[in-house]
């Protein structure tokens, strides 16, 4: 009987999660005489197969990062191999899973900041990429400072924009940083996917060396 998994030849779209071992048919096309067999063309990547009787399936796990959409065409052929129906477009949308970890573009970053700089004004960006779909949590990155060294009086002098990776001074940092006392700092920054919200997220870390420079601007004397 015709239903969710079988029916006549017509344009169709199917969504399949990447990474799944192929376990079931995608669709069973039904031939209308004089059609007796089917033919598959397009972006098959030797993964998608149609048996001559119209059984469309895939023979190995899909990878969204290789191809997020497979544009296929199915035609119905008669017993002489002549196309009698179609070809019609069959679209396979590959749904993302969290199978890639975020990675920083650099394992070490270096930057400098002038003392008394305005709090919240970025002086350095760290950047990570994740091959997963940025429109899903799998590819949504969350930056945070893990460690600041040295840490004086348990006060954070630096902050990071969780979404953009922009590093800037906190209010305390703007007021208290003094190159004469401590000219350099090291931050360990982490990035997590899943928007940082899941125990199943992947993460990466990077090191940031920051030099504090003297503010040579002096307030004019009255």
């Amino acid at each position: 009987q015709e239903g969710k998994f079988s029916g006549p030849l017509k344009p169709m779209t199917f969504s399949i999660y990447e990474g799944q071992e192929p376990s079931q048919i995608i669709f069973q096309f039904k031939a209308n005489p004089p059609a007796v067999t089917f033919e598959l063309t397009g972006e098959t990547d030797n993964i998608f197969v149609i048996e001559r009787e119209g059984l469309l399936y895939y023979n190995r796990a899909l990878d969204r990062e290789t191809r997020s959409t497979h544009n296929l065409q199915v035609a119905a052929l008669d017993a002489n191999g002549i196309i009698v129906e179609g070809p019609v477009p069959i679209t396979i949308k590959v749904k993302d899973i969290n199978d890639n970890r975020p990675t920083f573009l650099q394992s070490k970053y270096e930057g400098s900041v002038r003392q008394n700089s305005r709090p919240g004004k970025p002086f350095l960006y760290v950047n990570a990429t994740d091959l997963d779909d940025p429109a899903t949590p799998n590819g949504q990155l969350y930056y945070q400072i893990v460690i600041q060294l040295p840490m004086i009086n348990n006060v954070m002098y630096f902050q990071i924009n969780n979404k953009t990776g922009a590093i800037s001074l906190t209010r305390e940092g703007s007021q208290e940083l003094n190159p004469a006392k401590n000219p350099s700092y090291n931050l360990v920054i982490s990035v997590k996917d899943m928007g940082g919200q899941s125990e199943n997220s992947f993460s990466d870390t990077t090191s940031v060396d920051i030099i504090v420079t003297e503010n040579i601007w002096k307030a004019p004397k009255p």
């Epitope: 005489p33 004089p34 007796v36 067999t37 001559r52 008669d78 017993a79 002489n80 191999g81 002549i82």
Partner: antibody
Framework: QVQLVQSGAEVKKPGSSVKISCKVS????????IHWMRQAPGQGLEWIGY????????VYAQKFQGRATLTADKSTSTAYMELSSLRSEDTAVYYC???????????????WGQGTTLTVSS | DIQMTQSPSSLSASVGDRVTITCRVS???????LHWYQQKPGKAPKPLIY???TLASGVPSRFSGSGSGTDYTLTISSLQPEDFATYYC?????????FGQGTKLEIK
């Protein structure tokens, strides 16, 4: 080995009908289409149509639609071509032929019958 | 209907000659759908080349085919006495299947 053996020569009067047979052996009759062509004296080949015995699917060239009838008898592995309302221009050698298995990717006429001469004359 | 035009219609040549027959198709077809047949007087045609360039079973290697789109050729590299016959191209692209008018190859 594959063979297509056609019935003998025919002489017919204008307006009458003829039925030519093509008995096959050496392969599964229902796995291949059977095509019919004709060749008028000193002329080229003209395709009449085909039958797929497995499903009794028949396709005709428009020129022969309504005048040619292709049938198949699975029990005897024999295909037939009947041509009605004969006229002198139908005088020709008629051939049956088959392409490879219908699952093939390469379709051409790989085996032919020996031909049947039809003469239409008053 | 797809028209098939062969040239030349007839050709005189000698044993050992290299001969080329051309077939022009009235619309573009896939090269897998163009075939050549050989016919001798009083006999049924026999397959020579299918899919433009693949030799049918038992066909000697002096025969070759090439082409794409609308223009196809059959070449006999060194004519043998048994090659004198009529040659037909045929399209398998669409119904009705059509043949060229034939090229008669005669001994000079």
């Amino acid at each position: 080995q594959v063979q297509l053996v056609q019935s003998g020569a025919e002489v017919k009067k204008p307006g009458s009908s003829v039925k030519i047979s093509c008995k096959v052996s050496g392969y599964t009759f229902t796995d291949h289409t059977i095509h019919w062509m004709r060749q008028a004296p000193g002329q080229g080949l003209e395709w009449i149509g085909y039958i797929f015995p497995r499903d009794d699917i028949v396709v005709y060239a428009q020129k022969f639609q309504g005048r040619a009838t292709l049938t198949a008898d699975k029990s005897t592995s024999t295909a037939y071509m009947e041509l009605s309302s004969l006229r002198s221009e139908d005088t020709a050698v008629y051939y049956c032929a088959r392409p490879p298995y219908y699952y093939s990717r390469n379709f051409y006429f790989d085996y032919w019958g020996q031909g049947t001469t039809l003469t239409v004359s008053s | 209907d797809i028209q098939m035009t062969q040239s030349p219609s007839s050709l005189s040549a000698s044993v050992g000659d290299r001969v080329t027959i051309t077939c022009r198709v009235s619309s573009i077809i896939s090269s897998s759908k163009l075939h050549w047949y050989q016919q001798k007087p009083g006999k049924a045609p026999k397959p020579l080349i299918y899919g433009t360039s693949t030799l049918a079973s038992g066909v000697p290697s002096r025969f070759s085919g090439s082409g794409s789109g609308t223009d196809y050729t059959l070449t006999i590299s060194s004519l043998q006495p048994e090659d004198f016959a009529t040659y037909y191209c045929q399209q398998w692209s669409n119904y009705p299947f059509t043949f060229g008018q034939g090229t008669k190859l005669e001994i000079k």
